[in-house]
């Protein structure tokens, strides 16, 4: 921290300009009025201050706003934002999407820092939900953002926001997250026709239940193997050979290459071998002909 010393004669800053780069840290502390700094924050970005000088400027703002900066200052922080700690940011009340964009721009091209994560958290909590414009903005800067949220946090995403989601935004989502997102996507895209609907819903299908997969199998969707391999195992197991054949269309031949991997492996174990043979792919491991299959889970449900 810089010692309190009187400002030398003639050095009192009348505006925030480049002459301040020639000030020593103690001179900045003594000669720059915090209120002046707050009203001219936008100028700081255009001046090549050292990191040490930025520390002094931050300290002056902290003294002026001990309860947290107002949004008028936050919006113009620019690269001074990188000097903020998560504790500083928790004091803020950021409501404007423009402010959020301005600060995300500063961190562009870098991993999501703890500061950015805290900023986003504060912003989303302030809004009450993850609306479409916010989601648009966040996924533009951080494609993996959606998959960094817990299922509980994802539950606050309104179905209308799902339109902003691109396939790559879901690349790192796990099944628990897709379980939450899929019903929202289904609702969001419900008024689309068959082929358009499938294009939109495809990347969310890792959360789809069996009955929805059965319905899709009736629509000539020709699901690719990459999508099929991401389906929930428990949703795939009850599908018949005929349903899987319809679901995959010409891509059904890809099952052979994936027969040792889940969910294909587990699905094969549940099918009759003679049904598998109808595919002509040489899939092995099905239930031998003549064996009786008891579904114990059904029996338990009945008793």
């Amino acid at each position: 921290e810089v010692e309190k010393t009187a400002c030398p004669s003639g050095k009192k800053a009348r505006e925030i300009d480049e002459s301040l780069i020639f000030y020593k840290k103690w001179e900045l502390e003594a000669c720059v009025d915090a209120a002046l700094l707050a009203t001219q924050m936008d100028r700081v970005n255009a001046i090549p201050f050292t990191y040490e000088q930025l520390d002094v400027l931050k300290h002056k703002l902290d003294e002026l706003y001990p309860q947290g900066y107002p949004e008028s200052v936050i919006q113009h922080l620019g690269y001074l934002f990188l000097k903020m700690s998560p504790e500083d940011i928790r004091k803020w009340n950021v409501t404007s999407l423009e402010t959020l964009k301005a600060l995300l721009e500063v961190n562009k091209g870098h991993e999501m820092s703890p500061q950015v994560a805290t900023l986003i958290d504060r912003f989303v909590k302030g809004r009450g939900q993850l609306d479409k414009d916010t989601l648009d903005t966040l996924t533009a800067f951080y494609p993996g953002y959606l998959c960094s949220l817990s299922p509980e946090e994802l539950s606050s995403v309104p179905p209308s926001s799902i339109w902003a989601v691109r396939p790559q935004d879901l690349d790192t989502c796990d099944p628990r997250q897709l379980d939450v997102l899929y019903p929202k996507a289904r609702l969001a895209f419900q008024n689309m026709n068959g082929s358009e609907y499938f294009v939109k819903i495809q990347s969310f299908l890792g959360g789809a239940p069996t009955e929805d997969l059965k319905a899709l199998s009736q629509q000539n969707v020709s699901m690719d193997l990459a999508t099929f391999m991401k389906l929930r195992t428990d949703a795939v197991l009850p599908l018949t050979v005929a349903e899987v054949q319809k679901l995959l269309g010409p891509h059904v031949e890809g099952l052979k290459a994936e027969e040792r991997h889940r969910p294909v492996r587990d699905w094969i174990l549940r099918q009759r071998q003679d049904d598998l043979d109808t595919l002509g792919l040489g899939l092995q491991g099905g239930i031998p002909n003549g064996y009786l299959v008891l579904d114990l889970s059904m029996q338990e449900a009945l008793s």
Epitope: E18, D42, N45, A46, I47, P48, F49, Y79, E105, V106
Partner: nanobody, 118 residues
Framework: LQLVESGGGLVQPGGSLRLSCAAS????????IGWFRQAPGKEREGVSY????????NYADSVKGRFTISRDNAKNTVYLQMNSLKPEDTGVYSC????????????WGQGTSVAVSS
């Protein structure tokens, strides 16, 4: 994306050096540039400044009349011409770029050493 300084070296008092600050991976056109120096055990201090257009320059009192800053945007480089060098000019000189098109980017170079000694 980085700034690279060059041109430092050992020079006798009264001698001259020209330092260069070249941008790699981005264009300097939109950036204001500052030259700074740090002597061993001392605080880093501002030496010179040039605006993005080159229309405005500024100097620390200790170097006024001896140092001249200029820029050649075609070469993506900013220069610091240092004349009448003194032993107290010794230090590591680094350049910094601030502003940019989005008005929120900044870059620092690693520095080049200047030693003024007889």
């Amino acid at each position: 994306l980085q700034l690279v300084e060059s041109g430092g070296g050992l020079v006798q008092p009264g001698g001259s050096l020209r330092l260069s600050c070249a941008a790699s991976g981005f264009t300097l056109d939109y950036y204001a540039i500052g030259w700074f120096r740090q002597a061993p055990g001392k605080e880093r201090e501002g030496v010179s400044y040039i605006s993005s257009s080159g229309g405005s320059t500024n100097y620390a009192d200790s170097v006024k009349g001896r140092f001249t800053i200029s820029r050649d945007n075609a070469k993506n480089t900013v220069y610091l011409q240092m004349n009448s060098l003194k032993p107290e000019d010794t230090g590591v000189y680094s350049c910094a770029a601030a502003g940019g098109y989005g008005n929120s980017s900044r870059y620092w170079g690693q520095g080049t050493s200047v030693a003024v000694s007889s």
